[in-house]
Interface confidence: low
């Protein structure tokens, strides 16, 4: 008995062939005999199956001897042993209909789970593997589940049904809802006016939620929140606003926030969430201010940093062209009785510098400026 | 449509505590914050606080920090005011609302009466 | 707390004429372009009901007789021609800053 394999919502031929290359009487039945379709001369006959209005065949082919069955829009129900009778032989043809369906929504927050789910006959047993767009293999039964998806994980899963040896592939389109970034890090000078940027990794036409930014200042006990907006068909209006500090937003995507100035006081790391509609769970961005100071008090020329710094990144204090006079994996630096002359503070990771400020140490009798 | 449904008048004593509730219907309930607002007979409108259904994030105005406790219950689509040590002084008309697509609160409740009487 | 003055505390006007209410807040209520402050209106033994945020845009369902204008501290709302059932008690709030506060209300009379 042959097999073919179908997928739900496809079409499906079965072949049906005679030795006579020419046109000549011929029947479609299911397993219970009940009559789908045959021809009377030149025309197509159909009974009284389920199958009535999806069943068809090509009369194109009759004359070569060929009568197919053509089932549309296939239903997991369709699985059945199907009879060709034609010239006093029958052909069986066992059609076995597989589903495969995502979870609830295609569209899934990351860190959520993917779980596919296959529909199949009674009787049958197959198995599946599904391949995700970053090449992770994954084999299952009826259910198959990806738990904490990540942004590789958007696009195109090939999933590879296998049944008696044939097979039956079903291509599903995920899209991770997330953050282009996990977490970023801005590195100011005070006073400089700061950009966040939170660039989504995804497109939708339509994007209506609401978020929030709150923020864990570095000398703060406690979080607080920055700003909370609504996010409606890609426009964003702001709900409420700290004053201190004034955050600014943009009014389109993407999400784009402006902190007047940069303080000392508002170093430390911000965390964005942004709740969608018709989504359960939020999407997160970790954002990150450090603050560099440059000060000089009577003999005392000092450089501080304040915000989320990793123990690597170092503190330097020198004189303009020439070697650093102090160079520390501290958050502050400082010089006694500097000379007088254009200073830099900088702020550097394996030798690369990530902040750079200078101030200008006049002689003993003046005051200092800063540029 | 939206409707904010808020429960019955209350008639307490001095130094007890009291708990109203404005039921949301018409509309995702974690969606919109709901806002509290008081009005004592002939006065005028004095603002409470607010929650965010969905995180139950509440902000109060430090006046009635207090005073009134704001919470939310998501799965009856329900937002709750309680309020604390009441006096006379908080013997008033309470509403809850919501905002439009404006900054304005388009949706009110129809007010719970609080009379606080020994 | 930002402090709403609105003036006066009552008027009457007649029928067909022009009412104009006065807000004035103890500082400026404007961010990115836009003016924080709405209008409402409160009849007895109701909720109030929102005519206009933002300072001038309408709320939907409410009739074009009233309108509101001005931006920084000073916004004004003016109901022409004044009909019947406009008398009532108007409030101007300010949606700006943390805590939202209301003007103390003007009574609208009829004539």
């Known amino acids: 008995k042959k097999v073919v394999l179908g997928k739900k919502g496809d079409t499906v031929e079965l072949t049906c062939t005679a030795s006579q290359k020419k046109s000549i009487q011929f029947h479609w039945k299911n397993s219970n005999q009940i009559k789908i379709l045959g021809n009377q001369g030149s025309f197509l006959t159909k009974g009284p199956s389920k199958l009535n209005d999806r069943a068809d065949s090509r009369r194109s082919l009759w004359d070569q001897g060929n009568f197919p069955l053509i089932i549309k829009n296939l239903k997991i129900e369709d699985s059945d042993t199907y009879i060709c009778e034609v010239e006093d032989q029958k052909e069986e043809v066992q059609l076995l209909v597989f589903g495969l369906t995502a979870n609830s929504d295609t569209h899934l927050l990351q860190g959520q789970s993917l779980t596919l789910t296959l529909e199949s006959p009674p009787g049958s047993s197959p198995s599946v593997q599904c391949r995700s767009p970053r090449g992770k293999n994954i084999q299952g039964g009826k259910t198959l589940s990806v738990s904490q998806l990540e942004l590789q994980d958007s696009g195109t899963w090939t999933c590879t049904v296998l049944q008696n040896q044939k097979k039956v592939e079903f291509k599903i389109d995920i899209v991770v809802l997330a953050f282009q970034k996990a977490s970023s890090i801005v590195y100011k000078k005070e006073g400089e006016q700061v950009e966040f940027s939170f660039p989504l990794a995804f497109t939708v036409e339509k994007l209506t939620g609401s978020g929030e930014l709150w923020w864990q200042a570095e000398r703060a006990s406690s979080s607080k929140s920055w700003i909370t907006f609504d996010l409606k068909n890609k426009e964003v209006s702001v709900k409420r606003v700290t004053q201190d500090p004034k955050l600014q937003m943009g009014k389109k995507l993407p999400l784009h926030l402006t902190l007047p100035q940069a303080l000392p006081q508002y170093a430390g790391s911000g965390n964005l969430t942004l709740a969608l509609e018709a989504k359960t769970g939020k999407l997160h961005q970790e954002v990150n201010l450090v603050v560099m100071r440059a000060t000089q008090l009577q003999k005392n020329l000092t450089c501080e940093v304040w915000g989320p710094t990793s123990p690597k990144l170092m503190l330097s204090l020198k004189l303009e062209n020439k070697e650093a006079k102090v160079s520390k994996r501290e958050k502050a630096v400082w010089v006694l009785n500097p000379e007088a002359g254009m200073w830099q503070c900088l702020l550097s990771d394996s030798g690369q510098v990530l902040l750079e400020s200078n101030i200008k140490v006049l002689p003993t009798w003046s005051t200092p400026v800063q540029p | 449509q939206v409707q904010l449904q808020q429960s019955g008048p209350e008639l307490v004593k001095p130094g007890a505590s009291v708990r109203m509730s404005c039921k949301a219907s018409g509309y995702t309930f974690t969606d919109y914050v709901i806002h509290w607002v008081k009005q004592r007979t002939g006065q005028g409108l004095e603002w409470i606080g607010e929650?965010?259904?969905?995180?139950?994030?509440?902000y109060s105005n430090a006046k009635f920090k207090d005073k009134a406790t704001l919470t939310a219950d998501k799965s009856s689509n329900t937002a709750y005011m309680q309020l604390s040590s009441l006096t006379s002084e908080d013997s008033a008309v309470y509403f809850c609302a919501r905002r439009g697509n404006g900054t304005g609160f388009a949706y009110w409740g129809q007010g719970t009466l609080v009379t606080v009487s020994a | 707390d930002i402090v709403l003055t609105q003036s006066p505390a009552s008027l009457a006007v007649s029928l067909g004429q022009r009412a104009t209410i006065s807000c004035k807040a103890g500082q400026s209520v404007d961010y990115d372009g836009d003016s924080y402050m709405n209008w409402y209106q409160q009849k007895p033994g109701q909720p109030p009901k929102l005519l206009i945020y933002v300072a001038s845009n309408l709320e939907s369902g409410i009739p074009a007789r009233f309108s509101g204008s001005g931006s920084g501290t000073d916004f004004t709302l003016n109901i022409h021609p004044v009909e019947e059932e406009d008398a009532a008690t108007y409030y101007c709030q300010q949606s700006y800053k943390d805590p939202l506060t209301f003007g103390a209300g003007t009574k609208l009379e009829l004539k």
């Open positions: 929650i965010y259904p969905g995180s139950g994030s509440a």
